[in-house]
Interface confidence: low
């Protein structure tokens, strides 16, 4: 599972798979807001 700042933001935005918040191998999220340090 992805639990970094990026992924928390994307999960809240509903961009991640809803099955346990796990990113599927063929899933490519939008590039908006991806984490930089």
């Amino acid at each position: 599972a992805c639990d970094t700042a990026t992924c928390v933001t994307h999960r809240l935005a509903g961009l991640l798979s809803r099955s346990g918040g796990v990113v599927k191998n063929n899933f490519v999220p939008t590039n908006v807001g991806s984490k930089a340090f």
């Epitope: 992805c2 639990d3 970094t4 700042a5 990026t6 992924c7 928390v8 933001t9 935005a13 990113v23 191998n25 899933f27 490519v28 999220p29 939008t30 590039n31 908006v32 807001g33 991806s34 984490k35 930089a36 340090f37």
Partner: antibody, heavy 122, light 107 residues
């Protein structure tokens, strides 16, 4: 003007302790996820620790190399970030940067301080 | 831990030329890759986030591409101030990791 100013670095003997501080100004500090990233002399970048925003319960994460020895914390009232470093080793010698991140949904903000040098040597 | 491997280690080019820097991840990281530029004695500077988004104020000559495990930073026409060390990083999994860096030097 946005600023992150690190302080607290210096020379310390192996096994000793130091507390680094990072003073933030010019942005809403409590909203930001903050990390410490270090760079040994002549080497690459290494992530050390992260503390989430106030709304994310200020949860923390650490690199394995520092887990149990370093503690990251924040004081949102003082717009300050800290790194308590105990049981220091020679391999902890590095410039330590604090870096702040906030996601607006359509864009991000990312700020870096200029770093503070920690030297662990006898 | 996700390992990022950058290549080449050193790239020697002249101003005006095109630079292509590679970053390969040991595991799938979707598009959670950022690129940083660092000059001697300075803090890193964010160039690209989300694999392909230019950060605020970054010139259009810098572009990023890739997804999954293979990522590229391209500088379309090198300016004298672009000669520096470039790092990729991933934020898909803890611990966050960086590549070892590519030094872009003047030929």
């Amino acid at each position: 003007e946005v600023q992150l100013v690190e302080s607290g670095g210096g020379l310390v003997q192996p096994g000793g302790s130091l507390r680094l501080s990072c003073a933030a100004s010019g942005f809403t500090f409590s909203n930001y996820w903050i990390s410490w990233v270090r760079q040994a002399p002549g080497k690459g970048l290494e992530w050390v620790a992260e503390i989430r925003s106030e709304s994310d319960a200020s949860a923390t994460h650490y690199a394995e190399a520092v887990k149990g020895r370093f503690t990251i914390s924040r004081d949102n009232a003082k717009n300050s970030l800290y790194l308590q470093m105990n049981s220091l080793r020679a391999e902890d010698t590095a410039v330590y940067y604090c870096t702040a991140y906030f996601d607006y949904g359509l864009a991000i903000q990312n700020y870096w301080g200029q770093g503070t040098l920690v030297t662990v040597s006898s | 831990e996700i390992v990022l491997t950058q290549s080449p280690a050193t790239l020697s080019l002249s101003p005006g030329e095109r630079a292509t820097l590679s970053c390969k991840a040991s595991k799938w990281v979707t598009t959670y890759v950022s690129w940083y530029q660092q000059k001697p004695g300075q803090a890193p500077r964010l160039l690209i986030y989300g694999a392909s988004n230019r950060y605020l104020g970054i010139p259009a000559r810098f572009s990023g591409s890739g997804s999954g495990t293979d990522f590229t930073l391209t500088i379309s026409s090198l300016e004298p101030e672009d000669f520096a060390v470039y790092y990729c990083s991933q934020s898909y999994n803890y611990p966050y990791t960086f590549g070892q860096g590519t030094k872009l030097e003047i030929k």
